[in-house]
Interface confidence: low
């Protein structure tokens, strides 16, 4: 299709080399067309071209995005050759920064509803460059946290070094919707609620003698509770002794609750004490089994292929730790009475003999 009739917009992404950040392009189609395409289409199923793999017109992605190669080659679709670029409705999301994102991006309606729509397209010329570190040491992050229930603010990273008085007029979007209430370089939130979480975009215009550019930055805002003041607590095992059958497999589960921490580095491990020896056990990875705003429950299992006599003399210890402190829970194994016949006992003794040899050759003192 002919792109010479597309409206043109110039954008600048000055990314920080110190942090991960995203970028978003909006398909700013002229208003009458936009209302068609950025909401559910009202076309009947019979009007859907048969090459589109959707059974229902409401499932159609509303706009199609292309990238224009600088060498004049034909337009490229944003394909899986750009795995870091995601299309969603009327937006194009860049997951990683880099000058290789520089280029021209064109969007147009996926479906043409009237002859006037044929020329309905937008060309966005995107320039991407690293922000000079010298320009501002304390620029706002592209990931900002708001403490639930308190007052907070969201700053536009590209303008956070300027005072409110110096700041140009800023246009803010939240999750793709225009926020018309504020035009300054930061949004002040009187009381933070969960719904303040989301993807914020701030735009301002920068002009030079030749042309004007929209400078854009994207901020991921998360609403959080305050960091915990408690060390983790172990929910399971509760009992310090566990009845077991010799020669049978056994799984002991350790579950612990970790309070929210902005920088979360939970530690959860199993170790075994045997007389004066102590060593950490190689066990399956810990997994998060429940995660809420306030805390996270993490589980890690220790698996014994067969319980031996030696295991009855050992102590199994679950150790958990966060930045506040650590907690442990010890478990002693106790043989179930009347659980096995002579064969079981002989088998268990045989296993124990093999394990003793393995133990002596493989285990060392825990430091």
């Amino acid at each position: 299709f002919n792109i010479s009739g597309c409206s043109t917009k110039k954008l600048l992404w000055a990314y920080s080399t110190r942090s991960e950040e995203e970028f978003i392009l909006f398909c700013d189609l002229p208003e009458p067309q936009k209302s068609h395409f950025c909401h559910r289409s009202q076309l009947s199923p019979t009007q859907v071209p048969d090459h589109l793999p959707f059974t229902d017109s409401k499932d159609l992605p509303d706009v199609q995005w292309y990238r224009q190669p600088s060498n004049g080659d034909p337009l490229e679709d944003i394909r899986k050759s750009y795995p870091h670029i995601i299309q969603d409705k009327c937006t194009l999301r860049f997951l990683t920064p880099g000058v290789n994102n520089t280029g021209s991006y064109i969007c147009r309606p996926k479906m043409i509803k009237s002859p006037y729509d044929v020329a309905c397209c937008v060309k966005m010329i995107l320039e991407v460059k690293p922000q000079s570190n010298a320009s501002c040491e304390n620029s706002a992050s592209h990931k900002q946290d708001l403490l639930l229930g308190s007052t907070g603010s969201i700053s536009c990273p590209s303008l956070s070094c300027q005072s409110d008085a110096q700041s140009p007029e800023v246009t803010w979007y939240k999750n793709g919707k225009l926020l018309s209430m504020t035009r300054s370089n930061r949004i002040v939130v009187d009381e933070v609620y969960i719904y303040h979480q989301g993807t914020y975009v701030c735009d301002y215009t920068q002009s030079d003698t030749a042309s004007s550019w929209t400078v854009r930055a994207v901020v991921q805002v998360r609403t959080i509770v305050g960091d915990t003041k408690l060390k983790p607590d172990i929910l399971d095992p509760v009992e310090s002794t566990l009845e077991v059958e010799l020669g049978k497999p056994l799984t002991i589960s350790c579950k612990a609750r970790f309070g929210f921490e902005r920088v979360f580095n939970p530690v959860m491990k199993w170790y075994i004490k045997d007389a004066d020896l102590e060593w950490e056990v190689s066990v399956p990875e810990a997994k998060s089994i429940k995660s809420t705003l306030k805390d996270e429950i993490i589980e890690r299992n220790i698996i014994l292929e067969k319980v031996t006599q030696r295991d009855l003399r050992r102590t199994f210890v679950c150790f958990v730790q966060n930045s506040i402190g650590n907690t442990t829970q010890s478990v002693q194994l106790k043989e179930k009475r009347g659980s096995g016949g002579l064969n079981d006992i002989f088998e268990a003794q045989k296993i124990e003999w093999h394990e003793t040899v393995r133990f002596q050759s493989h285990h060392h003192h825990h430091h």
């Epitope: 090459h51 793999p53 499932d59």
Partner: antibody
């Protein structure tokens, strides 16, 4: 990296509703399509349907009248309900993430991350 | 619905062999085809998408080709871990459909 954890009962009685949930960890449920696929014992794979995080769905016509797929973005999970089950619905059920590939005239989706699978037996 | 027919249904080969599996679509699907590998008791794993693009992390001995109705998956030099069942999948039109599978066994 993104991981999918499936949960739900392994045994369902005939004529009842099969319910499974898939929890996304290590990434957000947003901006992706999420599918359910099943595999009867010793047989091939059958696509059941997908849901976009916004709630848009598309189902296999062969199952459409009995299937509901829903999403809960706050919990980072999506669910499958299959009503009026019979023995023919006995299968391993998988959830998967669909990665979109936009081609010149079309949108394609391939499943690049899968759940571990849940064996569901329909029996009284 | 578009039907995909894989051949052969099963295949015996040795480590080091070159193996080719074909997938034929009941109507043209452009390049909208993917290949998956499935091992017993495990979920399928994406190998190839868009008929010939190798998924990241997949060894380069796997390759795909074809367009329209005829597609092939080639393993240039079989490794012990390659013995599994392979499925083709079309995503040109809904409903998404899979081939019946090709079981690759050790000779």
């Amino acid at each position: 990296q993104v991981q999918l954890q499936q949960s739900g009962p392994g045994l369902v009685k005939p004529s009842e509703t099969l319910s499974l949930t898939c929890t996304v960890s290590g990434g957000s449920i947003n901006n992706y399509y999420w599918s359910w696929i099943r595999q009867p014992p010793g047989k091939g794979l059958e696509w059941i349907g997908y849901i976009f995080y916004s709630g848009t769905t598309n189902y296999n016509p062969s199952l459409k009248s009995r299937v509901t797929i829903s999403v809960d973005t706050s919990k980072n999970q999506f669910s499958l309900k299959l009503s009026s089950v019979t023995a023919a619905d006995t299968a391993v059920y998988y959830c998967a993430r669909d990665v979109g590939i936009a081609a010149r005239n079309s949108y394609y989706y391939v499943m690049d991350v899968w759940g571990q699978g849940t064996t569901v037996t329909v029996s009284s | 619905a578009i039907q995909l027919t894989q051949s052969p249904s099963s295949l015996s080969a040795s480590v080091g062999d070159r193996v080719t599996i074909t997938c034929r679509a009941s109507q043209g699907i452009s390049s909208a085809l993917a290949w998956y590998q499935q091992k017993p008791g495990k979920a399928p794993k994406l190998l190839i998408y868009d008929a010939s693009s190798l998924e990241s992390g997949v060894p380069s001995r796997f390759s795909g080709s074809g367009s329209g109705t005829d597609f092939t998956l080639t393993i240039s030099s079989l490794q012990p871990e390659d013995f599994a069942t392979y499925y083709c999948q079309q995503f040109n039109s809904y409903p998404i459909t899979f081939g019946q599978g090709t079981r690759l066994e050790i000779k």
